[in-house]
């Protein structure tokens, strides 16, 4: 969380951003809130990016003002116009690119004053893993697959029964480049699996951490997976 203040005494307003991560090819949100103002026509929101000449986005007098927008963001940005009046200056970024990573500034002007806060935006690819029993294998084998990751993640297996055990000797992980030549498909196979146990396949890079669990018993198979972004710090 980054909290920024305006420059001069009573003419300062608090602006708050939250560091976040964007998933390449999908839409992302750059989060920014400010002390709300009841005079909508006086509110100005400017999004800027370090190293970029033009603006990322500008909203003023109740609507988008994109004449100064940098070419790299053309047609890809929007604020939540209906939420500006209650202090939401968050930016929706369409079709996130690897090059969108960097330091952004959310700069706000209202009838009460000015304020700004920076935001670190990371980009990469992350996806939920799915763990299945590989019935084609000669021994009891689990197969963990996740379709899109970047940068290349680490994969670690864990088990509820053998807590702390190192499965690197009995697992094999491969990374297959996807068609757009950036993201990769992650496939990890775990051998010598025992029944009545819960196994976890943990995939992690500097942006996200995802876990796929599978519980195998004689009568049923239960799966669960979740994904967590690692760098959601507020400013």
């Amino acid at each position: 969380l980054i909290i920024g203040f305006g420059i001069s005494g009573r003419h300062s307003i608090t602006v708050t951003t939250v560091a976040s991560a964007g998933n390449i090819g999908e839409d992302g949100i750059l989060s920014c809130t400010f002390e709300p103002d009841i005079k909508l026509s006086d509110i100005v929101i400017q999004w800027l990016k370090e190293g970029v000449l033009g603006l990322v986005h500008e909203f003023k007098e109740g609507k988008d003002e994109l004449s100064e927008q940098d070419e790299m963001f053309r047609g890809r940005t929007a604020v939540f116009a209906d939420q500006v009046i209650v202090g939401n200056a968050s930016l929706r970024l369409k079709n996130v690119q690897l090059t969108d990573a960097g330091t952004y500034k959310c700069y706000i002007i209202t009838s009460k004053g000015k304020g700004n806060a920076n935001l670190e935006y990371k980009t990469g690819a992350f996806s939920m893993p799915e763990v299945n029993v590989d019935y084609n294998a000669s021994s009891e084998t689990l197969r963990c697959e996740a379709p899109r990751w970047f940068p290349q993640p680490t994969v670690v297996w864990a088990s509820q029964v053998d807590q702390g055990a190192n499965f690197s000797e009995v697992s094999n992980t491969s990374f297959e480049l996807n068609s757009e030549n950036v993201t990769m498909k992650v496939v990890s196979v775990l051998y010598n699996v025992t029944i009545n146990n819960t196994y976890s396949c943990m995939i992690e890079n500097d942006i996200a951490k995802a876990t796929g669990d599978i519980k195998v018993t004689e009568s049923e198979i239960k799966r669960r997976s979740h994904l967590q972004l690692l760098n959601s710090k507020a400013s």
Epitope: I38, S41, E61
Partner: antibody, heavy 117, light 107 residues
Framework: EVQLVQSGAEVKKPGASVKVSCKVS????????MHWVRQAPGQGLEWIGA????????EYAPKFQGRVTLTADTSTSTAYMELSSLRSEDTAVYYC??????????WGQGTTVTVSS | DIQMTQSPSSLSASVGDRVTITCQAT??????LNWYQQKPGKPPKFLIY???QLAEGVPSRFSGSGSGTDYTLTISSLQPEDFATYYC?????????FGGGTKVEIK
């Protein structure tokens, strides 16, 4: 659940003052503007003013400037509207209304103020 | 101040009718307009925000549209519980101003 609970009906004499309260629960009171709107019998809605409790910033409709005072007690999440120099045309239902998710999204139940000699 | 002219001031309609209420602003309010429904003895109820977005729990027979200075609230098929007074509110320019209201009565 968001709730705005207002104080009870008041009967006042011309020239007196009235203070209406509005107790808020269900959202962060200090971080959003609270407005006051009134409605005279059989009439439309009229904006009086607003307060930002976190900083005690206030904005008033020009018509009410100098006669209305908006305050807030952040410890009890309660907003107050005091109207002075009452006259018969101030007889109305007074509402508090929040701007939390949107402009005037939640409303108090209303407080009837009757000004009569 | 921006003036909001609401029309008609009242109308009579039957259950199942399509009802249209309009609000005209004295200047462009850039879609910064909400609609409210009020029944006798009750506070206004938040209906539509930012011209066309339905508030939570509001039936889909209600819809809003418009831009610039002209805005419309439509009830596609009037239900018994819809007989009430409707108000528009502009919040683009300070101070916020309401339309005069439209009373929807049973024919």
């Amino acid at each position: 659940e968001v709730q705005l609970v207002q104080s009870g009906a008041e009967v006042k004499k011309p020239g007196a003052s009235v203070k209406v309260s509005c107790k808020v629960s269900g959202y962060p009171f200090t971080s959003y503007w609270m407005h006051w709107v009134r409605q005279a019998p059989g009439q439309g809605l009229e904006w009086i003013g607003a307060i930002y409790p976190g900083k005690s910033d206030t904005e008033y409709a020009p018509k009410f400037q100098g006669r209305v005072t908006l305050t807030a007690d952040t410890s009890t999440s309660t907003a107050y509207m005091e109207l002075s120099s009452l006259r018969s045309e101030d007889t109305a239902v007074y509402y508090c209304t929040s701007t939390w998710t949107h402009y005037f999204d939640y409303w108090g139940q209303g407080t009837t103020v009757t000004v009569s000699s | 101040d921006i003036q909001m002219t609401q029309s008609p001031s009242s109308l009579s309609a039957s259950v199942g009718d399509r009802v249209t209420i309009t609000c005209q602003a004295t200047q462009d309010i850039v879609k910064s307009l909400n609609w409210y429904q009020q029944k006798p003895g009750k506070p206004p109820k938040f209906l539509i925000y930012y011209t066309a977005q339905l508030a939570e729990g509001v039936p889909s027979r209600f819809s809003g549209s418009g831009s610039g200075t002209d805005y419309t609230l439509t009830i596609s098929s009037l239900q018994p519980e819809d007989f009430a007074t409707y108000y528009c509110l502009q919040f683009y320019e300070f101070p916020p101003t309401f339309g005069g209201g439209t009373k929807v009565e049973i024919k």
